[in-house]
């Protein structure tokens, strides 16, 4: 899972340059070959033209090249010239294709140079998966924005279904990509590429710029800015996971720069189950089973206008803030109200972003990110 410190291996710029130059040389080689063949055919055609009607004899002989003293029947000569013209035109087409390929390769080379020149601007694009101990005050890196991701989508001849599929076709740079899960319109997602594959970011909070206290329809469809804070949308997440089990990674950060990374094996239901989240395996990390309701328990999603929580006496989303998989209202809520400073009143404080077993029930977190990665189809329950 994403709780490891080893980095994915990225191709070095040297390797990329070797590949790029190799492609350029291949293009040039093809071009030279086409030019050579074309000039040979042109020479041959000139010789035949010069020979003209003077060349007669050896009927039916099509051996090339022809000796000037050969005697060729005019009809055979005409037939040969027609064949040569056809061949020449095919070579011409090949030449144009090669030239086109050459231009394309030169563009690719320029693009690599452009990327290379901007490479220095990028920070590391993989999750730092080591769980941070509070004493180490380790900072969790922000989601890196793409400079110009080298999209590998063309290999699929369609849009990728999710970030994991993008990873499988060779994409190694994190950033914004268009995906199109089966039966869904295309949409833009933040992909985090790690040594474990591609993860789709489904939630991000870091500055309080987006209001998360929204109704059911908003949580279903999604809201916010993929470049900033957002909730991807339950329907979009479900279209990514389908009926498969998934890994859910949760990154938390407090106001001192301490970070925690948790991972769960989950199953997300469709709207008919109120997008119930079921834990299908124990929690990975150091926070123990108290982090969330017991494994196997299915918790529906709730908002202030659609109360599906497990409390009969209370609407968790209404008394707290935002939409969440509320069990008893007190375990966690990463879609709560964003506080830049700790409010004095406890009543207000309980509405914040919290994860009880990490920094406590009344500690409003500074930043959170949720990522999902569907498992292979056979893993589905």
């Amino acid at each position: 899972g994403p709780v490891q410190s080893k980095s994915p291996r990225f191709a070095s710029w040297d390797e990329m340059n070797v590949l790029a130059h190799g492609l350029l040389q291949l293009g040039q080689g093809l071009r030279e070959h086409a030019e050579r063949t074309r000039s040979q055919l042109s020479a041959l055609e000139r010789r035949l033209s010069a020979c003209g009607s003077a060349c007669q004899g050896t009927e039916g002989s099509t051996d090339l090249p022809l000796a000037p003293e050969s005697r060729v029947d005019p009809e055979v000569l005409h037939s040969l010239q027609t064949q040569l013209k056809a061949q020449n035109s095919r070579i011409q087409q090949l030449f144009h294709k090669v030239a086109q390929q050459q231009r394309h390769l030169e563009k690719q080379h320029l693009r690599i140079q452009h990327l290379q020149s901007q490479f220095g601007l990028l920070d590391h694009k993989h999750l730092d998966h080591e769980v941070a101990k509070p004493a180490r005050r380790k900072r969790l890196p922000e989601m890196a924005q793409p400079v110009d991701p080298a999209h590998n989508v063309s290999r699929l001849h369609r849009l990728p279904r999710d970030c994991q599929e993008l990873f499988q076709v060779g994409e190694r740079q994190s950033g914004l990509f268009e995906i199109q899960p089966q039966g869904s319109p295309p949409f833009l997602v933040n992909c985090k590429m790690t040594s474990d594959g591609g993860w789709t970011v489904i939630q991000r909070r870091h500055d309080g710029s987006v209001d998360f206290n929204r109704p059911w329809e908003a949580y279903k469809a999604g809201f916010g800015d993929p470049h900033g804070e957002f909730w991807l949308g339950l329907e979009k997440v479900h279209s990514i996971t389908g009926d498969r089990n998934s890994r859910l990674a949760v990154q938390l950060r407090d106001w001192d720069g301490n970070a925690e990374l948790l991972q769960f094996s989950v199953h997300l239901g469709g709207e008919d189950t109120a997008y119930s989240l079921q834990l299908t395996a124990p929690v990975a990390g150091q926070l123990g089973a108290t982090t969330v309701p017991p494994s196997g328990l299915s918790v529906p999603f709730s908002t202030w206008d659609q109360d599906h929580d497990l409390r009969r006496d209370k609407n968790c989303a209404k008394s707290l803030s935002g939409g969440w998989w509320f069990g008893t209202c007190s375990h966690s809520n990463l879609n709560g109200q964003y506080f830049r400073s700790i409010p004095q009143q406890r009543q207000k404080l309980k509405k914040g972003i919290f994860w009880k077993t990490w920094r406590g029930r009344y500690y409003p977190l500074q930043a959170t990110t949720m990522l999902i990665q569907p498992m292979a189809a056979e893993a589905a329950s």
């Epitope: 924005q145 793409p146 400079v147 110009d148 991701p149 999209h151 989508v153 849009l159 950033g175 914004l176 990509f177 268009e178 319109p185 295309p186 949409f187 833009l188 329809e217 908003a218 469809a221 999604g222 809201f223 916010g224 800015d225 993929p226 470049h227 957002f230 909730w231 991807l232 949308g233 979009k236």
Partner: antibody
Framework: QVQLQESGPGLVKPSETLSLTCIVS????????WSWIRQPAGKGLEWIGR???????IYNPSLKSRVTMSVDTSKNQFSLKLSSVTAADTAVYYC??????????????WGQGTLVTVSS | EIVLTQSPDFQSVTPKEKVTITCRAS??????LHWYQQKPDQSPKLLIK???QSFSGVPSRFSGSGSGTDFTLTINSLEAEDAATYYC?????????FGGGTKVEIK
Amino acid sequence: QVQLQESGPGLVKPSETLSLTCIVSGDSISGYYWSWIRQPAGKGLEWIGRIYTSGNTIYNPSLKSRVTMSVDTSKNQFSLKLSSVTAADTAVYYCARERPDYGGNFFDYWGQGTLVTVSS
Amino acid sequence: EIVLTQSPDFQSVTPKEKVTITCRASQSIGSSLHWYQQKPDQSPKLLIKHASQSFSGVPSRFSGSGSGTDFTLTINSLEAEDAATYYCHQSSSLPHTFGGGTKVEIK
């Protein structure tokens, strides 16, 4: 501040292809959708289509058979080609940045527009 | 495609008056409705996104409301510089579509 600038011929002959380019400055072209929108004189706005920086496109079904869009991230620009034009394609053509938002995308920056007249 | 119907087509208003423009969608679009202002010989400018959120730098006299199929743009205390055509736009489903526009003239 993001700025968009359309360029291309102001006069196109019927049955020919209209070609426009939009140069983006002030921000990278990456991570956004880029749209073309047109407006015939005295009329409303019509969305032509959009392109993402990966080159993936979506066109308005009403124009789909005649539209081609492309993007050049190294030059921070994107282009529109509209084939087999008629007088009905005479309009002011705008390029616009379509800001992705999970609550529904919107056009936050527009070019100043370029008038294209189709006439022989 | 989703059809947006704006009303009225034209409004002549005196300064300081309140202006209300409505936009009706042919099917529910949640809050994926945005409003633009276009002054003569200028390109459109975003005023309101997601039915009710003001875009940065837009004067507070402009406000939006509604969800589903019925939306309203309100200009409280109209100023001379507000003379323009106002368009609604939906991005709930592709293709993007715009309302026919409402021209606001200062009396």
